[in-house]
């Protein structure tokens, strides 16, 4: 029985050219986390494997940094980075837990005026 829950940063915004931390946290379960995958739509960004450590996809290696923790830092943001991001926790024996984050990358002038998504 899967008892765990994923807490995420929810809906977030960031400035074009800046960076953002995508963060998920798995709670309410004693299951062992074997691997966390970070995906954007159907594209793999990075993997953190419990035994083998961090693995960044080739197409993102210059703009993605591992951490903090099991989170992921996106750098040099562009408007094209706007969209859904998923943290996929592979656990034993529970199975798979998925969290969703929506990121909007704003033009710097808009971001300066304080436009923000509210975290539900």
């Amino acid at each position: 029985m899967m008892t765990g829950t994923i807490e995420t940063t929810g809906n977030i915004s960031a400035e074009k050219g800046g960076s953002i931390i995508l963060q998920c946290h798995l709670s309410s379960t004693t299951a062992q986390v074997t691997q966390v995958n970070w995906e954007q739509q159907d594209q793999l960004l990075a993997i953190c494997n419990a035994d083998l450590g961090w693995h960044i996809s080739p197409s993102f290696k210059d703009r993605v940094a591992p951490g903090p923790g099991l989170g992921l830092t996106l750098q040099s943001l562009t408007v094209n980075d706007t969209g859904e991001y998923f943290c996929i926790y592979h656990t034993y024996p529970d199975g798979t837990y998925t969290g969703r984050i929506f990121l909007e990358v704003l033009e710097s002038s808009v971001a300066e005026h304080g436009a923000r998504f509210q975290i539900p």
Partner: antibody, heavy 123, light 109 residues
């Protein structure tokens, strides 16, 4: 589809270093999800995993061979290589390269293999 | 390391018969990490089953895998002439390291 091909000397002298290369065709070695591995099989015996490498250079090795093994990758040539030092007759085997799905979790396996190359250690 | 013991060492059967191959692990293995391979003389191994029970691409449905924990089974429902080969199980953990079983030879009776 992805294909693998081993190459290297078929004869190595005792105490020397065995060197093999695996060329990946039909796909990029710079995969976000796959490692690339080496497995060997002495004549008439079973399979023994040697070690595997990620495109970034991250490796994991069989502890029983780790002190003698170096696996490296050359993404510009779409190749990865094996070096096994201080060889003896016991290292005589068919050496295979294969695609390692260790990061795929529920599909962990060696799903694509090269044809293998026989290496004999003898003076 | 996890030792995989395959039995029997040799299985002598006729075409059309059912083959049952056993793989026993010295300690528990996640079924997600258990694979089976077929190897014919002079050829590289070919992946048959991954995740203990999922058939790899292009593998006929007469091949099936089952099991969990320490006991796993490969079943060939009706042996075809091309199925006579050596079969290996393999566990794909990182720590302790991945290992192969010693193999089961399926030969024509």
């Amino acid at each position: 589809q992805v294909q693998l091909q081993e190459s290297g000397p078929g004869l190595v002298k005792p105490s020397q270093t065995l060197s093999l290369t695996c060329t990946v065709s039909g796909g990029s070695i710079e995969s976000g999800v796959y490692y690339w591995g080496w497995i060997r099989q002495p004549p008439g015996k079973g399979l023994e995993w040697i070690g595997s490498i990620y495109y970034s250079g991250s490796t994991y090795y069989n502890p029983s061979l780790k002190s003698r093994v170096t696996i490296s990758v050359d993404t510009s040539k779409n190749q990865f290589s094996l070096k096994l030092s201080s060889v003896t007759a016991a290292d005589t085997a068919v050496y295979y390269c294969a695609r390692d799905g260790v990061l795929t979790l529920n599909k962990r396996s060696f799903d694509i293999w090269g044809q293998g190359t026989m290496v004999t250690v003898s003076s | 390391e996890i030792v995989l013991t395959q039995s029997p060492g040799t299985l002598s059967l006729s075409p059309g018969e059912r083959a049952t191959l056993s793989c026993r692990a010295s300690q528990s293995v996640s079924s997600s990490y258990l694979a089976w391979y077929q190897q014919k003389p002079g050829q590289a191994p070919r992946l048959l089953i991954y995740g203990a029970s999922s058939r790899a691409t292009g593998i006929p449905d007469r091949f099936s895998g089952s099991g969990s924990g320490t006991d796993f089974t490969l079943t060939i429902s009706r042996l075809e002439p091309e199925d006579f080969a050596v079969y290996y199980c393999q566990q794909h953990t990182v720590r302790p390291p991945l290992t192969f079983g010693g193999g089961t030879k399926v030969e024509i009776k």
